[in-house]
Each structure stands twice: as structure tokens, then as C-alpha cells.
């Protein structure tokens, strides 16, 4: 079960980074990307 939770969490992280990249293309990128810990 813990492997599944880790996989889901990592998948969501990957999606979040992808979304961040797309939003940065619209909004303009300034600093290094970061993702908040939940």
C-alpha cells in the first residue's frame, strides 16, 4: 500500500510540475521553480 501511495504522490508531483511549466509560459518565468510540500 505504501508503494501505491508513493506512486500516486509522485504522479501528482509530476503533473504539478508540468502544470507549473505551462503556467510559467503564460505568466512569464522569473525564479527557479518550486513546489510546496503538502
Amino acid at each position: 500500500h505504501s508503494d501505491g501511495i508513493f506512486t500516486d504522490s509522485y504522479s501528482r508531483y509530476r503533473k504539478q510540475m508540468a502544470v507549473k511549466k505551462y503556467l510559467a509560459a503564460v505568466l512569464g518565468k522569473r525564479y527557479k521553480q518550486r513546489v510546496k510540500n503538502k
Epitope: L27, G28, K29
Partner: antibody, heavy 115, light 112 residues
Framework: VEESGGRLVTPGTPLTLTCTVS????????MSWVRQAPGKGLEWIGI?????ITYYASWAKGRFTISKTSTTVDLKMTSLTTEDTATYFC??????????????WGPGTLVTVSS | AIKMTQTPSSVSAAVGGTVTINCQAS??????LAWYQQKPGQPPNLLIY???DLASGVPSRFSGSGDGTQFTLTISAVQCEDAATYYC??????????????FGGGTEVVVK
């Protein structure tokens, strides 16, 4: 950031609002349009990205068009109805991981659609 | 398209009390959420961005939390000048439609 062009128009009349900016380059910031009907909440219309690509709320597609020059961001509105009566705001967006001081709102311009 | 549901629509608080406003997104928006304060006749003023980052010049009694679809704005030690309408704004990215944004319906805060 200051909006202009709002006025009283009759239904069906097209209208273009202009957002004039100074002190920064539109090449570096995305700009959005937001509206607020009298006594109602805020409604996102659309955004002009730094990549010059525009995105719109689903209800605004086809009737609203955002364009820009070197110092202005325009909102062209067609087929206006009384439901479009609102104060229209132009806003400068925060850049990715940017400073909150990036976020600027104009004072708004009032559009009244009435017969 | 993204939809933001904000509750309650109105709340009353005593000076020194605490106010909690909730915002729910129709889809996972990660931390792409901002909170605004608006007073009559004025444009909105940014309070919180990226779900929990305090905007410059905003008193520390304002705080934001949340991630995904559930977000909260908390006003601690409420002051008279906090009487206003508060809005959340979410931003999403769709592979179909690209950039999308929406505001919550607003929460009127009345200070007694």
C-alpha cells in the same frame, strides 16, 4: 494600469475597452480582464500571456477578444446585452514564482448596456 | 472549466475574533489559488497568493492554507478595517483549453 472606454451603449453595440500601462513592459507580464456587475462578484474574462497567446472563460469565447500593442491591452466586446453591464478591470499578473507586488489592478471602467 | 465554490456567503465576527472562509475548486489546482479583499468602490487587493504566501504589506493576521481542491482563508484577531468582501481565485491548466481561471462567489465579512 488604467482602463478607459467604458460608456453607456445600447444592446448589440460593439465596444472596445483599453488598458494603458506605464512603467513596465507588456513583454514581461501577462494581463487579464475581470469584470464585476453592480453589487455582484468578480468574474474572470480572459488573459493575454507573455507568449501573446490568449485564453478565455468558456462563456466569453467568441464574443470577447483580447489584443495588445506595446503599451495597451484591449478588450473588444461584441453583441453586448444588459447582462454585460459591469465595471471592467485590467490586472497585471504575478510572474511565475514572482513577487506579490507584481499584482496590479486598475480602478476599473464602467460599461452600461441599456436600451 | 474550473469552478470555485466559496463558503459562507456572509459571516459576522466580533473585534478580536477569528473568521474562516473556505474555497473549493472543481478540480485539482495544486496551490494555484489567491485570496483578495475588496471594499466598496475599490478594486480588489491581493492578500494571499500561491495558497499560503502573504502578499507584501498585508498584516500577518491574514493566513491561507490548502492544496488540491480545498482552501481556507483565516483572519485572526479581526479588526474593524477587515470588514469587506473576500474572494478566492483559482487557476488551472487543461490540456484541452489551456489556461483557465475563476473566482469564488465572495464572502462578506461583517465586523461587530
Amino acid at each position: 494600469v488604467e482602463e478607459s472606454g467604458g460608456r453607456l451603449v445600447t444592446p448589440g453595440t460593439p465596444l472596445t475597452l483599453t488598458c494603458t500601462v506605464s512603467g513596465f513592459s507588456l513583454n514581461n507580464y501577462a494581463m487579464s480582464w475581470v469584470r464585476q456587475a453592480p453589487g455582484k462578484g468578480l468574474e474572470w474574462i480572459g488573459i493575454m500571456g507573455v507568449n501573446d497567446i490568449t485564453y478565455y472563460a468558456s462563456w466569453a469565447k467568441g464574443r470577447f477578444t483580447i489584443s495588445k500593442t506595446s503599451t495597451t491591452v484591449d478588450l473588444k466586446m461584441t453583441s453586448l446585452t444588459t447582462e454585460d453591464t459591469a465595471t471592467y478591470f485590467c490586472t497585471r499578473e504575478i510572474r511565475d514564482d514572482g513577487d506579490s507586488s507584481d499584482k496590479l489592478w486598475g480602478p476599473g471602467t464602467l460599461v452600461t448596456v441599456s436600451s | 472549466a474550473i469552478k470555485m465554490t466559496q463558503t459562507p456567503s456572509s459571516v459576522s465576527a466580533a473585534v478580536g475574533g477569528t473568521v474562516t472562509i473556505n474555497c473549493q475548486a472543481s478540480e485539482d489546482i495544486y496551490t494555484n489559488l489567491a485570496w483578495y479583499q475588496q471594499k466598496p468602490g475599490q478594486p480588489p487587493n491581493l492578500l494571499i497568493y500561491d495558497a499560503s504566501d502573504l502578499a507584501s504589506g498585508v498584516p500577518s493576521r491574514f493566513s491561507g492554507s490548502g492544496d488540491g481542491t480545498q482552501f481556507t482563508l483565516t483572519i485572526s484577531a479581526v479588526q474593524c478595517e477587515d470588514a469587506a468582501t473576500y474572494y478566492c481565485q483559482g487557476v488551472a491548466w487543461s490540456s484541452n483549453t489551456g489556461y483557465g481561471s475563476a473566482f469564488g462567489g465572495g464572502t462578506e465579512v461583517v465586523v461587530k
